[in-house]
Interface confidence: low
């Protein structure tokens, strides 16, 4: 049975199998002799010279040689002598051959062949039957071993059990020796007693060779499934586990590789390895320094953390978050460098794992793969990084990584670039520095370019337009990136992104980049020009009707359409509008579109949020005489009086600045009587009187943030849902698919997907927030 | 439910010595690791040594030389036998008790001031 040969290239003196001898034959290119194909054969030669047409090589390549090699020549009566040399040793030419232990020691044969690199006509003829005696006499070893283990073992068994460790250490190296050959290897496997009383001589001993003879010999057992049963039926696996601890190199790289085959081939074998204390002892070697040792532990690691929690746990416990990403610091060896970051990948979808890699800057480290030319290697970096990426907004240091993924989105490889998207959308997310580094190496020029390549592709689309969303928002450079994104003619692709087939994700993300890119007074007539203003009004009444409907239907739970609520995208769209409307020709087109019923209806929502935006939005389209006069019409004095005594202080301003500017026509006695329910209600906890009055509202939210909103709240939600299809990663099916990373719709970094039942924890360990203050499409929190 | 109770630690001149010791009790899986860590104001937790219940030792390298730890499982107490001491050797010095049980569980001591100072 084959092991997994790339990983089995110890450095260990293992003498090779007889049977490798025989398949040599059997297996490996030999000289056709024409005998098996007939390739060659032509009628024998009569004057015994040899066929001219037999020899199947260059002929300006012999002649070459000849004239190189042999200056001088022959005269008649030479060439006469050499010939009856010939034709005196002929027979014996052909004993050579075919028979050459029956020759004499010392015995000169002339051969016919002047390059001896070159076989002759007669040695070539006989390599068949040189074959066929070699099969012969392996087939008569063969059942000799057999024999000769058959009538051992018994004997052999006992003395591995005597007191007197002479005579234990004499007969492990016996043992170990018949373990060598095939036939004797099968009589000892299937002898228990006999496997068993090398286990136990091999975890009892003091002597260093009699522990390197026995795990010697285990090993060479386990390169059969019959013999991987026999070790884990005799308790070989604790006894293995406890070699680990072995100061003794080849003990421990016997111990090693015996548990690997063991534990891929053997069922049961994981757990007895895990009970057995396997993982911490494997945590402790990861400091060797022997590449294929390291890898071979390391894939061993990744087989018993591959979907098992409390294994994930222990090799945190036993400090090997720490191990493996000093690993992936120090080595270039690609295999290595591969099954450690298998491991990390199985790791960094646990909560507890997560931040521990983070912490032993496990970021940094893999980052320093991307650009290998091991695909295998960069992909699981990729996969690695993008569910470790939510974990990672604090950290320090990520110049490098930044670079690197926005030089990836340019990749051909549609897996590299998700990936590259997804982590750059979380890096991005509530970090001002990463934000900032991302613009400068210019990574909105290459997510714009993504975006517009991804086509229909939402794995893809989707956390590009997040990481926009983040970076068009709430640092130095958002400004620049607004504008950025219409220079590269990204405004086109985006508000497309708002219309079929695009899901309720990445609409939701959509919006909240339209919303920011209309931070910009640049934008706002691009935008308009694209009929994005039409559709965000469409999608905002389908949304509501959404959502008027269930709650029609008694529903009072807020539901999930494809991981979105639809009262996000009913305040998403109003924030979009909202920051629309400070133009005056959208105020034009918001109005015509007959959204004022609409926008006062939303007065009356029970979400602070939407109350804020619709408020925020009447406020603007209030400026135009026209459109106050509709809003009063459509009764929206009453809700808004109400809003002046919201708790929020967004809601209560937009709400009195609506009303404030209702009130421009109406008479001085209305005007007042106005002002002071507006002091005595704004100005509930430091009352002053109004100043210009009639400047009210014109900065709330300059900036694009409502007045009352947090710039530096840090918190932030991390939720499931959704996620990639994982299938169409492209994943080696052995790969755990424990994806996650980035979470299609997601304002916030995003957990790996498995592991929902750790959500509310993540929840709880957040500092208390005024939600009322964190408006969904304010890209980052 | 585990119980850790530290005992020793204290003031000590470099290079001298001092012995800390740990005793658990309640309900111990067989198969776990017990061991030391230390932390110092404003610091992260830090390891020192471990050993296992088949008595495999480990020691991080500032301590390797100077620091011995022993266990009775018997007694499933664990000592730690600290010579030569440093002045950086000043911590609150916590025992670990690792069970390797389904989930594993970690439990610590309630924590030893050692103070290393001429």
């Known amino acids: 049975m084959a092991t997994q040969a790339d990983l089995m290239e110890l450095d260990m003196a293992m003498e090779p199998d007889r049977k490798a001898a025989v398949s040599h034959w059997q297996q490996q290119s030999y000289l056709d002799s024409g005998i098996h194909s007939g390739a060659t054969t032509t009628a024998p030669s009569l004057s015994g010279k040899g066929n001219p047409e037999e020899e199947d090589v260059d002929t300006s390549q012999v002649l070459y040689e000849w004239e190189q090699g042999f200056s001088q020549s022959f005269t008649q009566e030479q060439v006469a002598d050499i010939d009856g040399q010939y034709a005196m040793t002929r027979a014996q030419r052909v004993r050579a051959a075919m028979f050459p232990e029956t020759l004499d020691e010392g015995m000169q044969i002339p051969s016919t062949q002047f390059d001896a690199a070159h076989p002759t006509n007669v040695q070539r003829l006989a390599e068949p039957s040189q074959m066929l005696k070699h099969a012969v006499v392996n087939l008569i070893n063969y059942q000799d071993d057999a024999e000769l283990a058959t009538r051992a073992i018994p004997e052999l068994t006992k003395l591995l059990n005597d007191e007197d460790q002479v005579v234990v250490n004499k007969a492990a190296v016996m043992v170990h020796q018949l373990s060598k050959k095939e036939a004797s290897r099968h009589a000892i496997m299937r002898s228990p007693q006999m496997v068993s009383a090398i286990v136990r001589t091999m975890q009892n001993t003091n002597d260093v060779e009699t522990a390197r003879c026995t795990a010697g010999t285990l090993h060479n057992l386990s390169h059969h499934r019959e013999g991987l049963l026999a070790i884990f039926k005799s308790g070989g696996i604790p006894a293995l586990v406890k070699m680990l601890g072995s100061p003794v190199d080849s003990v421990l790289f016997y111990a090693i590789t015996t548990l690997h085959n063991l534990l891929l081939h053997q069922e049961g074998a994981k757990m007895a390895v895990r009970l057995a204390g396997g993982l911490q002892k494997m945590v402790a070697l990861l400091n060797k320094t022997n590449v294929k040792f390291l890898a071979i532990t390391t894939d061993c690691l990744q087989i018993l953390a591959y979907g098992n929690q409390e294994s994930k746990l222990i090799i945190l416990a036993s400090g090997g978050p720490q191990a493996l990403v000093n690993i992936m610091r120090t080595y270039t060896y690609e295999k290595l460098l591969w099954t450690t970051s298998r491991v990390l990948k199985v790791l960094s979808v646990c909560s507890s794992n997560k931040p521990a890699i983070v912490e032993a800057g496990g970021m940094q480290a893999l980052g320093l793969h991307l650009t290998d030319p091991s695909q295998r290697l960069v992909q699981n970096c990729l996969w690695t990084l993008r569910n470790l990426s939510d974990a990672a907004t604090k950290q320090e240091g990520m110049e490098g990584l930044l670079g690197t993924l926005v030089q990836l989105l340019g990749s051909d490889d549609i897996n590299v670039v998700t990936c590259a998207a997804g982590i750059l959308s979380n890096l991005t997310c509530n970090n001002y520095k990463n934000k900032m580094m991302v613009c400068q190496v210019g990574g909105i020029e290459a997510l714009v370019r993504t975006v517009l390549r991804a086509g229909d592709r939402e794995d893809i689309t989707e956390p590009a337009i997040c990481a926009l969303r983040h970076l068009t928002s709430r640092h130095q450079e958002a400004e620049m990136a607004q504008n950025a994104v219409r220079l590269h003619y990204g405004l086109p692709v985006v508000v497309k992104l708002l219309h079929p087939p695009s899901h309720w994700p990445l609409i939701k993300a959509t919006v909240g980049l339209i919303r920011n890119l209309a931070l910009c007074p640049a934008n706002h007539a691009p935008l308009r020009e694209q009929g994005a203003i039409p559709r965000l009004v469409q999608l905002l009444v389908r949304a509501h009707q959404d959502t008027q409907r269930r709650t029609s239907m008694g529903g009072t739970q807020q539901q999930f359409v494809e991981g979105v609520r639809m009262e996000e995208i009913v305040e998403g769209c109003t924030g979009a509008l909202h920051i629309l409307a400070r133009d005056v020709h959208n105020r034009i087109v918001i109005r015509g579109l007959n959204t004022i019923p609409l926008f006062v209806q939303l007065l009356y929502s029970p979400i602070e949020n939407i109350q804020r935006v619709a408020a925020g939005v009447l406020c603007e389209l209030a400026q135009d005489k026209e459109a106050a006069e509709a809003i009063e019409a459509e009764g929206a004095t009453a809700p808004l009086t109400e809003l002046l005594h919201s708790r929020n202080e967004g809601v209560a301003t937009y709400a009195a600045a609506v009303l404030f500017r209702m009130s421009e026509d109406k008479p001085q006695d209305y005007k007042k009587r106005l002002s002071v329910e507006l002091t005595s209600s704004l100005f509930r906890t430091e009352p002053m009187a109004w100043n210009e009055t009639a400047d009210l509202g014109l900065d709330i939210g300059a900036q694009g943030e409502p007045l009352g909103y947090r710039q530096d709240d840090p918190s932030y939600r991390s939720f499931h849902s959704g996620g990639y299809g994982q299938d169409a990663l492209g994943m080696d099916p052995m790969m755990e698919h424990e994806m996650g990373g980035h979470h299609p719709g997601a304002d916030y970094p995003v957990d790996g997907l498995p592991d929902l039942g750790h959500a509310q924890d993540l929840m709880d360990g957040l500092p208390p927030g005024d939600s009322n203050q964190l408006a969904w499409f304010d890209t980052d929190l | 439910q585990v119980q850790l109770v530290q005992s020793g630690g204290g003031l000590v001149q470099p290079g001298g010595s001092l012995r800390l010791s740990c005793a658990a009790s309640?309900?111990?899986?067989?198969?776990?690791?017990m061991g030391w860590y230390r932390q110092g104001p404003g610091k992260q937790r830090e390891f020192v040594a471990s050993i296992t219940d088949s008595d495999l030792a480990n020691y991080a390298a500032s301590v390797k030389g100077r620091f011995t730890i022993s266990r009775d499982n018997a007694k499933n107490t664990v000592n730690l036998q600290m010579n030569s001491l440093r002045p950086e050797d000043t911590d609150v010095y916590y025992c670990?008790?690792?069970?390797?049980?389904?989930?594993?569980?970690?439990?610590w001591g309630q924590g030893t001031q050692v103070t290393v100072s001429s």
């Open positions: 309640g309900s111990i899986s067989s198969n776990n690791v």
């Open positions: 670990r008790l690792t069970m390797m049980t389904y989930p594993p569980t970690i439990s």
